[in-house]
């Protein structure tokens, strides 16, 4: 089986990858807190895509620590009992209920920083995270629907005469595959137990003046475009892998 070489039949056309930083956060600085105080308290829930293997920091509503009675994080992960991490300011005590994942911790001492951190985000961290700040005037909430993103592994190869296969393996969520030019395509999705999806698109081009085809893979973690020369070699299977 002859693998296509990057300098001739298979080449990277564009690789626009939004490389997430090693640590991502939706927290605001003190200036933003002052400006957006009431707005943030109204925006109770946030959907937050986070790339796998990065660190994530989740923040509580911007309430002055001196006004606090209790800070609590409620963590609801699929198939697990609700985990509660609480800090009672007046007695300087912390308490945990049903919390088993050691990668989910307070950023520092809760009396200094109420934020929650997830070290090395994994697929299992998909879920809902909610900070409740208890004050004498009521509870203030901030919730995150955390969606863990997994970059798919992309491959493109020719498996039959004038037929190419583009695969986005084990992505989360599912990648979208499109072709230039459009061919006679069939797309199949395969769902894995860990929540990832493999998308396989097989296309055939009857028109003989199409010599090069491009597979474009769109994903929340970044887009990849590959092209391949359609070689009229019966039985030959040209392939390459892109990391």
């Amino acid at each position: 089986e002859g693998a296509a070489q990057p300098n001739n039949s298979l080449m990277l056309q564009t690789s626009k990858e939004n490389h997430a930083l090693a640590s991502s956060s939706l927290c605001m600085d003190e200036k933003q807190i002052t400006q957006n105080y009431s707005k943030v308290l109204a925006e109770v829930n946030t959907s937050w895509p986070v790339k796998m293997a990065t660190n994530a920091v989740l923040c509580c509503p911007p309430i002055a620590l001196r006004n606090l009675i209790i800070i609590t994080w409620e963590i609801i992960l699929r198939g697990q009992p609700s985990c509660t991490k609480a800090y009672k300011k007046e007695t300087n005590e912390t308490k945990e209920t049903n919390c088993t994942d050691e990668r989910i911790t307070w950023v520092s001492r809760p009396d200094q920083n109420s934020d929650l951190q997830i070290r090395t985000v994994a697929i299992t961290h998909d879920g809902y995270y909610r900070c409740i700040m208890v004050t004498p005037d009521g509870n203030f909430h901030r919730g995150y629907h955390l969606q863990v993103l997994v970059t798919p592994e992309v491959t493109l190869f020719q498996n039959r005469n004038r037929t190419a296969v583009c695969k986005a393996v084990a992505g989360k969520p599912a990648a979208h595959i499109s072709w230039i030019p459009e061919g006679d395509c069939a797309t199949k999705q395969e769902y894995w137990s860990n929540g990832t999806v493999t998308v396989k698109s097989t296309c055939h081009w009857e028109v003989h003046n199409v010599s090069t085809v491009t597979c474009h893979v769109s994903h929340l973690t970044g887009n990849k475009s590959l092209y391949i020369e359609l070689l009229p070699v019966p039985g030959a299977k040209k392939s390459a892998k892109l990391y």
Partner: antibody
Framework: EIQLQESGPGLVKPSQSLSLTCSVT?????????WSWIRKFPGNKMEWMGY???????NYKPSLGSRISITRDTSKNQFFLQLNSVSPEDTATYYC?????????????????WGPGTMVTVSS | EVQMTQSPSTLTASPGESVSINCKAS??????LAWYQQKPGKPNKLLIY???TLHSGTPSRFSGSGFGTDFTLTIRNLEPEDFGLYYC?????????FGSGTKLEIK
């Protein structure tokens, strides 16, 4: 069994201070829990006023502002309510109560032991 | 502050009957509602907390239901000692607030 008993003057003059004592038996108030004051007005409306916790920290209903103070005497196993600048609207039955044991600190704010209550009338 | 509206204010029933008392919160308090029984000169009794959890010592004829803003205390097969004043209390947030009370009287 934990028992609470309120005591204090049944009549207070307007603009003066109302002072009540809650004596706790069967448990040492410095060992745990939060200890609260609640009142019931004529017509049966109930109002949570505030608490002192086992470490001595307090939390008051914001609308009572600077009028309220809850303190304690650990040697006598008692905690106290002082309400300043009272008016006839403060006429009520005053209860002391113990918060339920905290399971996760949050939302466990209900009362499993109460005193029988003491009636206070504010009138000249 | 969360307003708690309790109804009815008075309820008349006979022993053996079933009754329901309603409590409505002005905002979503999830399941965090407690019910108390009050009798003159006696300490209040905690009956139910977290909407439906029976406190130790509460007879099984008492039950609580509801979520969000609407809650119900149901007493089945009323006993003579069940008559008195009943209160709901939200324990979702500070300041803690109570319903206006329901007086359960013997017919």
């Amino acid at each position: 069994e934990i028992q609470l008993q309120e005591s204090g003057p049944g009549l207070v003059k307007p603009s003066q201070s109302l002072s009540l004592t809650c004596s706790v038996t069967g448990y040492t108030i410095t060992s745990g829990y939060d200890w609260s004051w609640i009142r019931k007005f004529p017509g049966n409306k109930m109002e949570w006023m505030g608490y002192i916790n086992y470490g001595g920290s307090t939390n008051y209903k914001p609308s009572l502002g600077s009028r309220i103070s809850i303190t304690r005497d650990t040697s006598k196993n008692q905690f106290f309510l002082q309400l300043n600048s009272v008016s006839p609207e403060d006429t009520a039955t005053y209860y002391c109560a113990k918060y339920n044991e905290y399971k996760s600190y949050i939302y466990d704010w209900y009362f499993d032991f109460w005193g029988p209550g003491t009636m206070v009338t504010v009138s000249s | 502050e969360v307003q708690m509206t309790q109804s009815p204010s008075t309820l008349t029933a006979s022993p053996g009957e079933s009754v329901s008392i309603n409590c409505k919160a002005s905002k979503n308090i999830r399941s965090y509602l407690a019910w108390y029984q009050q009798k003159p000169g006696k300490p209040n009794k905690l009956l139910i907390y977290s909407g439906s959890t029976l406190h130790s010592g509460t007879p099984s004829r008492f039950s609580g239901s509801g979520f969000g803003t609407d809650f119900t205390l149901t007493i089945r097969n009323l006993e003579p000692e069940d008559f008195g004043l009943y209160y709901c209390q939200q324990h979702h947030e500070y300041p803690l607030t109570f319903g206006s009370g329901t007086k359960l009287e013997i017919k």
